[in-house]
Interface confidence: medium
């Protein structure tokens, strides 16, 4: 039998708590252990999200919004734990939650402020339009509206375009910027400021280099320190301009240590890569390799491209031939 | 159905003590707490405190430690509080409440008792 | 202690008219109140809880809400059983307290 008696006075306090979209949290609420617990979650102070009472739930009136997304940690009731385990939050769970504990020797009301925050990767795109070249910071979901800032070799720039469009639960959002002719280095940082989380990417324009028909060609790939960190998993994407689309040389994955190579010209060395070198070779080199290769280190929070121009010229002999 | 049969009036000296009892009936008496309520004309109604009916746990409002002491017999489904030392502010009614899970609080009340302090 | 002042005190309504009361929480009490009905030979009855929750048996004229702190009771239409004193109580947190009451009168 589990009598009903709730006491002592406890202040109410208040805690938030940041879930991801459509991941499981926990909303937090701990009373001084005792017997008879009654435990109440309500959400806004109208729906009944959770009820526990004479040691069961008692879920007839839950409401539907949360049918099989609950559950207490029934073990440590008893220790005063009186936490709830919330599976799948979406953009709709924001709010307060309430939790209405009574025991023998206490009634507390705890409320909890439920933020949740959606950050798919974001990417920074190299793009050809006509004769125009662009940078593109995009981000497919984004939830609260991010903070996207632009930097021109190391200097904030504040002109930028912000392409926004709006869904149910969250922004896609993309940030397009001007390089046409331009040598500098560009930066975009795009900032969660609810869920503390930032990406950057960073793109760096290597001077051209002229080779001859059927030479080879080195191109440099190391990332900057500054974002690169080894023990995260990252890829790296070597791709090649044409007809204003890339098409994939080869790709690394830092997690499995496997590199795909779709060009046999194309060769990798594997003691640079464990130095995290990831500079390139491309062999025997033709007129129809002349172009911009692309670089693509990518982790869940950077992106940083690299892009050369070669220009492949005839050999001498070729030119005599012709 | 579910019913709170409180003891009849009272007239008592002051300084002296009063035991009042709440008969509880119509559902299992130890499974809910019982509050006892004063109101008195200058004070409108005040939560006196809980007991809990199956462990005997008690909790009082502060302003009233002191002056009641709440009891419970199980055998005989009746919960008391006894008002000690007496004095013409006691002068009032006194109601015992249920408590509930689901719906909460004084879902059920008491007749009330009438407790006058007089010499 | 949280406070409830109740206002007004009292109120003198016709049949058939629409009165409100009104409960102010001097804390944040989430919801967690009830409205209780007095009758002129001291019998106490519970008519809402949660704010807005009609107890059983009792009539659809009734109503609660809230906006912010401010709790109210509504009687859509009044009838001739309801002119008693009302209560608002309340229970988010030890020791319960009440309002100071609204006597209804009859116009």
């Known amino acids: 039998i589990f009598p009903l008696a709730f006491f002592i006075y406890v202040p109410m306090n208040e805690q938030i708590v940041i879930g991801r979209l459509d991941e499981d949290i926990i909303l937090p609420s701990s009373f001084e252990r005792g017997s008879e617990v009654v435990i109440h979650w309500k959400y806004q102070d109208s729906y009944k999200v959770h009820s526990y009472y004479k040691g069961s739930d008692h879920l007839e009136s839950q409401d539907p919004r949360y049918a099989n997304r609950t559950s207490l940690f029934y073990n440590e009731i008893q220790n005063g734990n009186a936490s709830l385990f919330f599976r799948r939050v979406s953009l709709l769970d924001e709010g307060i939650y309430t939790c209405y504990v009574g025991t023998a020797i206490q009634v507390i009301t705890n409320k909890v402020v439920l933020k949740v925050g959606v950050f798919l990767t974001p990417v920074m795109k190299y793009e050809k339009r006509n004769t125009n070249s662009f940078l593109i910071c995009s981000v497919l979901s984004v939830y609260p509206r991010p903070i996207i800032t632009w930097k021109m070799d190391n200097t904030p720039i504040s002109e930028n375009n912000m392409e926004e469009t709006g869904s149910l639960d969250s922004f896609s959002i993309n940030s397009p910027l001007n390089i046409t002719g331009s040598n500098s280095s560009y930066e975009c940082t795009i900032e969660n400021s609810l869920l503390k989380q930032t990406w950057t990417g960073r793109w760096t324009m290597k001077d051209g280099l002229h080779k001859m028909q059927s030479e080879h060609v080195s191109l440099s790939c190391q990332p900057v320190n500054d974002y690169f960190s080894p023990n995260q998993d990252f890829k790296v994407t070597w791709s090649r301009m044409k007809s204003g689309t890339f098409s994939v040389l080869a790709y690394y994955l830092s997690s499995s240590q496997n590199t795909i190579i779709n060009e046999s010209r194309f060769s990798w060395n594997k003691e640079l890569i464990n130095q995290s070198d990831f500079s390139m070779n491309l062999m025997d080199l033709n007129l129809s390799d002349s172009g911009e290769y692309l670089c693509n280190i990518s982790s869940d929070e950077y992106t940083l491209l690299t892009i050369h121009t070669v220009h492949v010229e005839p050999s001498q002999e070729t030119a005599s031939h012709n | 159905q579910v019913q709170l049969q409180q003891s009849g009036a009272e007239l008592v000296r002051p300084g002296v003590s009063v035991k009042i009892s709440c008969k509880g009936s119509?559902?299992?008496?130890?499974?809910?707490?019982m509050h006892w309520v004063k109101q008195s004309h200058a004070k409108s109604l005040e939560w006196i405190g809980s007991?809990?009916?199956?462990?005997?746990?008690?909790n009082y409002n502060q302003k009233f430690k002191g002056k009641a002491t709440m009891t419970v017999d199980k055998s005989s489904s009746t919960a008391y509080m006894e008002l000690a030392r007496l004095t013409s502010e006691d002068s009032a009614i006194y109601y015992c409440?249920?408590?509930?899970?689901?719906?909460?609080?004084?879902?059920?009340w008491g007749a009330g008792t009438t407790v006058t302090v007089s010499s | 202690d949280i406070q409830m002042t109740q206002s007004p005190s009292s109120l003198s309504a016709s049949l058939g008219e629409r009165v409100s009361l009104t409960c102010r929480a001097s804390?944040?009490?989430?919801?967690?109140l009830s409205w209780l009905q007095q009758k002129p030979d001291g019998t106490i009855k519970r008519l809402i809880y949660s704010t807005s929750t009609l107890d059983s048996g009792v009539p659809k004229r009734f109503s609660g809400s809230r906006s912010g702190s401010d709790y109210s009771l509504t009687i859509s239409s009044l009838e001739s059983e309801d002119f008693a004193d009302y209560y608002c109580?309340?229970?988010?947190?030890?020791?319960?307290?009440f309002g100071g009451g609204a006597k209804l009168e009859i116009k």
């Open positions: 119509g559902y299992t008496f130890t499974d809910y707490a």
């Open positions: 804390q944040d009490i989430s919801g967690y």
């Open positions: 409440a249920r408590g509930n899970y689901d719906d909460w609080y004084f879902n059920v």
């Open positions: 109580l309340q229970y988010a947190s030890s020791p319960y307290t």
């Open positions: 007991i809990s009916t199956y462990y005997g746990d008690t």
